[in-house]
């Protein structure tokens, strides 16, 4: 079991000098600082008893094992439920204390309750102020029974519970109709998930035989000792004021543990210290009586006499809970209570023994869990002792449970069990993560769920050049840091695997699963020149670039223009997606628009240093389209075209455009100006005897408009080869623009 | 669902015996205090007896005490009311209700007792 | 055995509030916060609207309220609907030993 410790200071006469705290003796408890340690949690849990709010109450972490709870400031805001959270993955345990106000109408006999599944439990609610109404019972805050006022026997209201099962368990409480939540008794029942001396799943296996008031965990078999007792089977008590799994605790202040009450994991629940009593835990055992709520009586035998805090002490010559036994018997000496090895380790296991006559190597003997004897190898004799050592076979998994050491002369015999552990090595069931590249290093996250036990002692990471039959490189690394792989090649898959380790021998884990993680390439340095650009249209712009002359080939993959609206906020972006390119055509811009362009050159997913930028500003938008276009041969070099004025024009038109283009000719095509703009109709002169043109025109205002639908017309006869197209409109000769 | 059936109403003449029983499904019956309240016709709600879920403890109006006896039986998810000495005044609907902390959170249909001669 | 005092009758149109009133002494209502409710429909058992003073059972319409003071207990419908026409009677637990309960003499609900 987890060792987990909830302490309550009941000195109820003065709330603000009440305090829970919350004791943890596990290894690396309450650190919180990473995903292997969760932090101690102390908190009132008003699921279940709800109190009128008060002031927050004050958490206070001493050290890392260690969370205080104070700032009570009136009797009812101890009335409740208050829980402490501890220990790590499938060990975290919750621990739970329920306080009653010592003013209730109805006090508990006692309130925590343990049973075995299937008993009867009987929960009894002590009348302390009389009411002459109903009496309500709730199980975990929802109407459970009723009785009659009349109904108390001997002052006590009680709530019988037959054949309880687990789904049984939770807080009960019994209150007067009418009466504040505060005056009601509360309890709590714990409802093993095993019969008596029962655990594991099936309920199959037997309960080690818990000593001096120790409770048989049902899930794992282990006892959960009372506090000031220790022990596989608590058979060892611990000094006066001392508590927790190893006594490594110690209760606070001068008096003791007097006034403490303790609540330790289920299936224990909770109880005064060992050698206290009472609702309060101020009362000392009677004489005769010992351990926790002084529930044990000591029956000291050969002179015996009786410890309220550990039971019998035994005068020379006897040992033994009742000092039954003659010193002349062997005993087992200083054998641990447990024991933890990891799986596949051959470990070696002491058992030192002593007794009239003197224990050998023969009468010393293991007995494993599933019956196997295993005979010592070698012992050591000394003066007062005698050591056997054994070497165990190969652990496996079944190995986990309860050994007993037993020695046997002819003075007697006596055996001790321990309890033997065997761990898992972890195995990690993810792959490391990445968090970050560059060209040559990797940031990793070595933090990967796991199977097996932890805790995790030493995170190791391997890796190599994917497809590389070189060594693996292997770096330790400490679990709760990310790690940075350097010295790495460029543009290059590395395999990665996380191997973990739990301490002891044998705890190295197998290796987790591969993960391929990819350099970056190297960044791009050079930076281009805008060398030009030009507008094509309205919504269209010609950009050219160079790069600067360096040896040795080009380092990058293209090029990304980059294109600021400033006015909308707005950036566009264009790849370009060859490195040998120094010119691109962007189109769908936004006529009238004031640009701000730049380029870069990348490589992978790095850019480079940008250009200096460039500003451009669009021509707005132009009018609508001249409609019903047509051309008419007028001679062997002329064509007159006739049109209609566009539509819904946004203003006076300043001139027209007409394109002329030889059908089917390579060439680039030649743009006429028109520049009255009244007209609608023009004559295109110095054209080519029977050849077949192309024609289209557009109008301008403050830009260039659309273009018109393109018409064809051939130049009549065969006349000579003329220099070039003109335009006339009404015998008016215009100037050429190309 | 909870649901509570009355039934063994009828007609019986003045100073007649009747026993009427209420079928209880839907929830834990021995743990719930049960009440039998009536409805003379055109007339308003009358409590008429109460028993704990122990069966021990019993208590009745003024009108039908010594007369009247209600009880249950746990095992079988029944509550009764036994009604000796019938009057004309006893003729009414009567309900079968569970109580749940001084309120009546769930009711019958009712059955119709007449006393006439 | 008294009874609770209730108005015989109230009456409201669709989409008013109306409350009824529920008087008793200071061994029930007023000793007590175990006011009830109940709806009765005509030819139907009555139905739980309040429980505890101002508890509302799942199911029943937030349009239904209810409150204390003193020795009066108050039950107020809002928004008044067609169907809330009906009969309310009010119940309290007491402290007399020997009875379960004790009824109002019930208010007709009329919808104009």
């Known amino acids: 079991a987890v060792d987990l410790t909830l302490l309550a200071n009941l000195r109820l006469t003065d709330p603000q000098r009440f305090f829970l705290t919350c004791v943890s003796g596990e290894a690396g408890a309450g650190r919180g600082s990473d995903a292997w340690g969760p932090p101690l949690l102390l908190e009132k849990d008003d699921r279940i008893v709800r109190t009128p709010p008060g002031p927050p109450l004050r958490l206070a972490r001493n050290g890392s094992h260690q969370v205080t709870l104070r700032g009570f400031s009136k009797p009812s805001d101890l009335v409740g439920v208050f829980s402490c959270v501890g220990g790590a993955g499938a060990r975290r345990t919750r621990v739970i204390y329920v306080h009653n106000s010592p003013g209730a109408h109805l006090l508990p006999d006692k309130v925590t309750h343990t049973v075995n599944k299937g008993d009867t439990a009987v929960l009894s609610a002590r009348v302390h102020k009389e009411k002459q109404t109903d009496v309500i019972w709730k199980s975990n805050g929802s109407y459970f029974y009723t009785l009659d006022w009349h109904e108390a026997q001997d002052g006590r209201f009680l709530l019988q519970l037959p054949n309880v099962q687990p789904p049984s368990s939770g807080i009960y409480s019994a209150t007067y109709l009418e009466a504040s939540p505060l005056g009601s008794a509360f309890f709590r029942l714990i409802v093993r998930g095993c019969g008596a001396g029962r655990w594991g799943p099936g309920c199959t296996k037997e309960c080690p035989g818990c000593l001096h008031g120790g409770v048989c965990h049902d899930h794992d078999g282990e006892c959960v000792c009372p506090p000031g007792f220790t022990g596989t089977r608590c058979e060892q008590a611990c000094r006066e004021g001392r508590f927790g799994q190893s006594c490594q605790e110690q209760c606070p202040g001068i008096s003791g543990c007097r006034g403490l009450t303790f609540c330790l994991p289920d299936p224990y629940g909770c109880s005064c210290g060992s050698g206290w009593r009472g609702s309060q835990c101020q009362e000392a055992c009677a004489p005769g009586h010992f351990g926790a709520d002084c529930r044990l009586q000591c029956q000291c035998q050969n002179g015996g006499t009786c410890d309220r805090f550990s039971g019998c002490v035994c005068p020379s010559g006897w040992h033994g809970v009742h000092c039954e036994k003659s010193d002349r018997i062997p005993q087992i000496l200083n054998m641990a209570s447990e024991l933890e090895f990891n799986l596949e380790t051959m470990p070696r296991i002491n058992c030192a023994a002593a007794g009239n006559p003197f224990p050998v190597r023969g009468s010393i003997e293991l007995r494993k869990p599933d019956g196997t004897v295993l005979l010592s190898t070698k012992a050591i004799v000394e003066p007062e002792k005698t050591t056997a050592e054994f070497e165990v076979p190969r652990l496996v998994l079944a190995d986990s449970g309860f050994w007993e050491c037993r020695v046997s002369t002819s003075g007697g015999q006596d055996s001790r069990r321990f309890k033997v552990n065997v761990k898992v090595p972890p195995v990690p069931l993810a792959a490391p993560r990445l968090l970050t590249k560059q060209s040559r290093q990797l940031v990793v996250s070595p933090l990967v769920s796991f199977s097996g036990d932890g805790p995790i002692s030493t995170v190791r990471l391997h890796y190599r050049p994917q497809d590389s039959t070189m060594d693996w490189s292997t770096i330790v690394v400490d679990p709760s840091e990310n790690v940075t792989l350097m010295n790495l090649r460029p543009k290059t898959g590395y395999s990665v695997r996380v191997q973990l380790s739990r301490p002891g021998e044998g705890g190295e884990g197998a290796w987790g699963p591969p993960t391929l993680m990819t350099t970056d390439c190297p960044e791009p340095l050079l930076q281009p020149w805008l060398e030009g650009w030009h507008v094509e249209g309205t919504d269209r712009l010609r950009v050219s670039w160079s790069l600067p002359l360096v040896p040795g080939p080009l380092v990058g993959d293209g090029f990304l223009l980059r294109l600021w609206d400033g006015t909308r906020g707005q950036e566009r972006r264009e790849n370009v997606s060859s490195p040998q390119a120094r010119t691109a055509l962007l189109t769908g811009l936004t006529p009238g628009t004031h640009y701000q362009l730049d380029v870069q050159l990348y490589h992978c997913t790095l850019l480079g240093p940008a250009s200096p930028p460039a500003h451009v500003l669009l021509p707005p938008s132009g009018p609508p389209a001249p409609r019903h276009l047509h051309a008419q041969a007028l001679s062997d070099s002329e064509i007159q075209l006739t049109w209609k004025h566009p539509e819904a024009l946004p203003g006076p038109i300043s001139k027209y455009v007409v394109e002329v283009q030889v059908a089917g000719g390579a060439g680039d095509p030649l743009w006429i100006d028109v520049d009255r703009p009244e007209e609608t109709s023009t004559i295109i002169r110095g054209l080519n005897a029977s050849t077949r043109y192309l024609f289209r025109m557009r109008a301008s205002i403050q830009g260039l408009g659309d273009w018109s639908n393109t018409v064809e017309e051939s130049t009549l006869g065969n006349g000579l080869q003329a220099e070039g197209p003109v335009q006339e409109s009404r015998a008016a000769e215009e100037g050429l623009d190309q | 669902e909870v649901q509570l059936l009355e039934s063994g109403g009828g007609l019986v003449q003045p100073g007649g015996s009747l026993r009427l029983s209420c079928a209880a499904s839907?929830?834990?019956?021995?743990?719930?205090?049960m009440d039998w309240v009536r409805q003379a016709p055109g007339k308003g709600l009358e409590w008429v007896s109460s028993?704990?879920?122990?069966?021990?403890?019993?208590y009745y109006a003024d009108s039908v005490k010594g007369r009247f006896t209600i009880s249950r039986d746990n095992s079988k998810n029944t509550l009764y009311l036994q009604m000796n000495s019938l009057r004309a005044e006893d003729t009414a609907v009567y309900y079968c209700?569970?109580?749940?902390?001084?309120?009546?959170?769930?009711w019958g249909q009712g059955t119709l007792v007449t006393v006439s001669s | 055995q008294s009874e609770l005092t209730q108005p015989a009758s109230v009456s409201g149109s669709p989409g008013q509030s109306i409350t009824i009133s529920c008087t008793g002494t200071?061994?029930?209502?007023?000793?007590?916060?175990?006011v009830s409710w109940y709806q009765q429909h005509p030819g139907k058992a009555p139905k739980l609207m309040i429980y505890?003073?101002?508890n509302r059972p799942s199911g029943v319409s937030n349009r239904f309220s209810g409150s204390k003071s003193g020795n009066t207990a108050s039950l107020t419908i809002s928004g008044l609907q067609a169907e809330d026409e009906a009969d309310y009677y009010c119940?309290?637990?007491?402290?007399?030993?020997?009875?379960?309960?004790?009824f109002g003499g019930g208010t007709k609900l009329t919808v104009l």
């Open positions: 505890e003073v101002s």
């Open positions: 119940s309290s637990y007491t402290s007399s030993s020997t009875l379960g309960g004790v």
């Open positions: 839907g929830f834990t019956f021995s743990k719930y205090k």
């Open positions: 028993i704990y879920p122990s069966g021990g403890f019993t």
């Open positions: 200071s061994s029930d209502v007023g000793g007590y916060n175990y």
């Open positions: 209700a569970r109580e749940k902390m001084a309120t009546m959170d769930y």
